[in-house]
């Protein structure tokens, strides 16, 4: 039950990448507006995105306070121009979101190869440590700061001219690999959280190849 012409939100969905977290829902409002509330399991409700006609709400500022907590959100529906109006039970219509634990569920963003440097038959490949919106002591933490050794990177590398491809893995942001002298190689990396069963991997990084400006070659 609810106020005439007011419908409850549905299909509440968390969209989260590297902890940037947005709650989305349906339907597009017709003569109604929405307010979102978010809470931890044991905490108080906090209102966000007051009386909005959007069907999304950025909840990043709330979830980054503790990314290992489990959060629940709810979306309230109000008649447009009459937000004090409530349902027959004395409350506005609302719908609950699924629970969301950022540390376990945020998608891993596409990584970027920061640089590669060849010294003789060794190449050092460095993955950019992306900054997140998670803060500690007024400083934004990197993905590695947040996940520590729970995050690994897989490097794929291959000779530009070959159908062969090799792999290395690291729980830091650096790889040191052996290459054949005088050959040009291409590189791609992928972020992985081995302890997860879902949202386990990122998409592959853009491919970077030797002979392009990101790399450096030194003959020793």
């Amino acid at each position: 039950s609810g106020t005439t012409n007011t419908v409850a939100a549905y299909n509440l969905t968390w969209k989260s990448t590297n902890f940037k977290t947005i709650l989305e829902w349906e339907p597009k409002p017709v003569n109604q507006v929405y307010t979102v509330q978010i809470s931890t399991k044991s905490g108080d409700w906090k209102s966000k995105c007051f009386y909005t006609t959007d069907t999304e709400c950025d909840l990043t500022d709330e979830i980054v306070k503790d990314v290992k907590q489990t959060y629940l959100a709810r979306v309230f529906s109000y008649p447009a121009g009459n937000v004090e109006s409530t349902g027959s039970a004395g409350e506005p219509l609302y719908e609950n979101s699924p629970e969301f634990t950022p540390y376990l569920e945020t998608n891993l963003g596409q990584p970027t190869i920061q640089s590669f440097e060849q010294v003789g038959t060794k190449v050092n490949v460095t993955v950019e440590d992306e900054r997140t919106l998670v803060r500690r002591n007024n400083t934004f933490l990197s993905l590695r700061d947040v996940f520590g050794k729970d995050l690994i990177y897989t490097l794929y590398y291959w000779k530009s001219s070959s159908s062969g491809k090799k792999t290395a893995k690291t729980n830091t942001n650096e790889f040191l690999i052996d290459v054949d002298k005088g050959e040009n190689y291409c590189f791609s990396v992928q972020a992985v959280i081995p302890s997860r069963t879902v949202n386990r991997k990122s998409t592959d990084s853009p491919v970077e190849c030797m002979g392009q400006e990101k790399g450096e070659f030194r003959e020793i």
Partner: antibody
Amino acid sequence: QVQLKESGPGLVQPSQTLSLTCIVSGFSLTNYNVHWVRQPAGAGLEWMGVIWTDGKTDYNSTLQSRLSISRDTSKSQVFLKMNSLQAEDIATYYCARDWDTGFDYWGQGVMVTVSS
Amino acid sequence: DIKMTQSPSSLSASLGERVTISCRASENINNILAWYQKKEDGSVKLLIHYTSNLQSGVPSRFSGSGSGKDYSLTISGLESEDIATYYCQQAYTPYAFGAGTKLELK
């Protein structure tokens, strides 16, 4: 559910070519890498090679000169071809799915004997 | 290439006993280590990946630990269904397995 099943001749003549097929179900070959592993009688597991999601390959250097791995993504099949078979190639051959930090599903294995 | 040295090659233990198998890599493998169980019927099962992550469906009596070059698999209380050969594996190219540890009942 995820399954891998190896098939091929149980008997190969010396110096001939071994051809094995791994039929997979429950996942796509464009999303998961597939490896071949073998176990000679009385010995341990030996990694042979892999076909990556993009169709590129990597082989154990000791087998590289006579090993080839390919696939047919539309039929969900991975193929192993190894030539110049000898007695030391007598083994159980497995295909396995790569889960980044381990091989999470394995076929039941196919026993291959080399004899004239 | 990274080589894996597993020990012991075989061991006998009683039901309920705590069993530990060791694996040493020839260089630092950054915890990229898996453990497998191979039964007499030929079936192979992933037990633990990334040093200590228990694969779904594997009993909690199995655990893994280690870092750098040295790793171990522990069975906290041996059960009859655990009689098998155990292998460690590093997941760098070229992938390599340890030689195996055959676990038997005392």
